[in-house]
């Protein structure tokens, strides 16, 4: 059956979000990144549950800390300045979850490193894309 245009748009937005998150993860994992050890000391809150677009609220709330850690890296690995990357992500997240959402994010008890955090949200995006395909 043909995919609806709204579903296609959601898929493309998720793909764009994935691209940005994978770009950050690649930059962090780059073997030339000398600040990786320090970056891994920063802790991020993880969602208790992330299965629907509304759960992107949990990602949105962690974007400021993410930007701060990326600024620390001062790396050319990210292809864009951290501020621009986070701005891109923020715009997409707002479009995907809806700006009028009243969803209250619930966080897991355990915090995570930046790598675990990014992996979690990349997995989330890929999972939603797969269900929409």
């Amino acid at each position: 059956a043909p995919t609806s245009s709204s579903t296609k748009k959601t898929q493309l937005q998720l793909e764009h979000l994935l691209l940005d998150l994978q770009m950050i993860l690649n930059g962090i994992n780059n073997y030339k990144n000398p600040k990786l050890t320090r970056m891994l000391t920063f802790k991020f809150y993880m969602p208790k549950k992330a299965t629907e677009l509304k759960h992107l609220q949990c990602l949105e709330e962690e974007l400021k800390p993410l930007e701060e850690v990326l600024n620390l890296a001062q790396s050319k690995n990210f292809h864009l300045r951290p501020r621009d990357l986070i701005s891109n992500i923020n715009v997409i997240v707002l479009e995907l979850k809806g700006s009028e959402t009243t969803f209250m994010c619930e966080y897991a008890d355990e915090t995570a490193t930046i790598v675990e955090f990014l992996n979690r949200w990349i997995t989330f995006c890929q999972s939603i894309i797969s269900t929409l395909t």
């Epitope: 994935l18 691209l19 994978q22 770009m23 690649n26 992996n119 990349i122």
Partner: nanobody, 118 residues
Framework: EVQLLESGGGLVQPGGSLRLSCATS????????MGWYRQAPGKQRELVAV???????NYADSVKGRFTISRDNSKDTMYLQMNSLRAEDTAVYYC????????????WGQGTLVTVSS
């Protein structure tokens, strides 16, 4: 080292056509999601077109009906056919290839400049 190499950019008049190519090493081609995004000075990066490992395609509203993404698995190459080009399509175009499973490797090229001007 894994590389993606774009080609086909250049100067074209409004209403004209260009075909961009993205040549990859075979290890990152089959099964990977691939796409094209563009960056114009002072603008947000825009994801233009995507093609999955299975061949499903998706386009930004701004290029729908004008651009066509395709891939030739036998040549490890992806293409972006751009027709009815407009001034607002002027940008550096980058191709990328990404894993759809952990460790989520991402590769992208150096970009090719497309200028639409009379």
């Amino acid at each position: 080292e894994v590389q993606l190499l774009e080609s086909g950019g250049g100067l074209v008049q409004p209403g004209g056509s260009l075909r961009l190519s993205c040549a990859t090493s075979g290890t990152i081609f089959s099964g990977y999601t691939m796409g094209w995004y563009r960056q114009a000075p002072g603008k947000q990066r825009e994801l233009v077109a995507v093609i999955s490992g299975g061949g499903d395609t998706n386009y930004a509203d701004s290029v729908k009906g004008r651009f066509t993404i395709s891939r030739d698995n036998s040549k490890d190459t992806m293409y972006l056919q751009m027709n009815s080009l407009r001034a607002e399509d002027t940008a550096v175009y980058y191709c990328y290839s990404r894993e759809v499973t952990p460790p989520w490797k991402l590769y992208w090229g150096q970009g090719t400049l497309v200028t639409v001007s009379s």
